[in-house]
């Protein structure tokens, strides 16, 4: 026998209290698939998060980060502070890359300059905190 709830589309829930009729999701909630017996609470983009896409009755809100921060984790579950190029984020804040390392992005860690001699090459352009070395012939 077919479950009557399977007829309830996204944006509704199957109301067991009312002979399994399809009732619309309450405001600030959604159901992204049919046949659900409850709706899900919409994500709230607050604080350092900002709304990239509003919640609808059929899809959750999507958040990104305010300027000066970038997303981390699935679905932007966290916001991490940006640093300048040539820096990395530590527990004490943004710190310049140590000599011999670089970071060409606003996120991530400082990485060692390429060792040109490993490939039998010489340094064509010296590295900086922001840029890797350029190896020559």
């Amino acid at each position: 026998l077919q479950d009557p709830c399977s007829n309830c589309p996204a944006g509704t829930f199957c109301d067991n209290n009312r002979n399994q009729i399809c009732s619309p999701c309450p405001p600030n909630s959604f159901s992204s698939a049919g046949g659900q017996r409850t709706c899900d609470i919409c994500r709230q983009c607050k604080g350092v998060f900002r709304t990239r896409k509003e919640c609808s009755s059929t899809s959750n809100a999507e958040c990104d980060c305010t300027p000066g921060f970038h997303c981390l984790g699935a679905g932007c579950s966290m916001c991490e502070q940006d640093c300048k190029q040539g820096q990395e984020l530590t527990k004490k804040g943004c710190k310049d890359c140590c000599f011999g390392t670089f970071n060409d992005q606003k996120r991530g860690i400082c990485r060692p300059w390429t060792n040109c001699s490993l490939d039998g090459k010489s340094v064509l352009v010296n590295g900086t905190k922001e840029r890797d070395v350029v190896c020559g012939p």
Partner: nanobody, 122 residues
Amino acid sequence: EVQLLESGGGLVQPGGSLRLSCAASGFTLSAEDVGWVRQAPGKGLEWVSAILDFGGSTYYAESVKGRFTISRDNAKNTLYLQMSSLRAEDTAVYYCARVVYHAGGGVTFDYWGQGTLVTVSS
């Protein structure tokens, strides 16, 4: 026992106004997320307006924004819906409803009253 009793419906001409009331007993309106749903003839339920503590906001359906105003009187444990500039498409049975948050994050709503019929016609 939880009860919600809607009143204030009736026949009104297009452009007219009505105020619906919902008197609650068995629970405290001010401690709940509550609102109004309606069912037009031959149609499904539609959320009209709600006061949402979870979202920290007042919700209005696009079709009623700027025309309907939801409010509550905590002392009287009563919810109101002030409706103005009424249109034929607002004709429906209006029910007072309570949003229910379930363990595990699910959301549904309850409504118990018989509703109050609003007919907009000339």
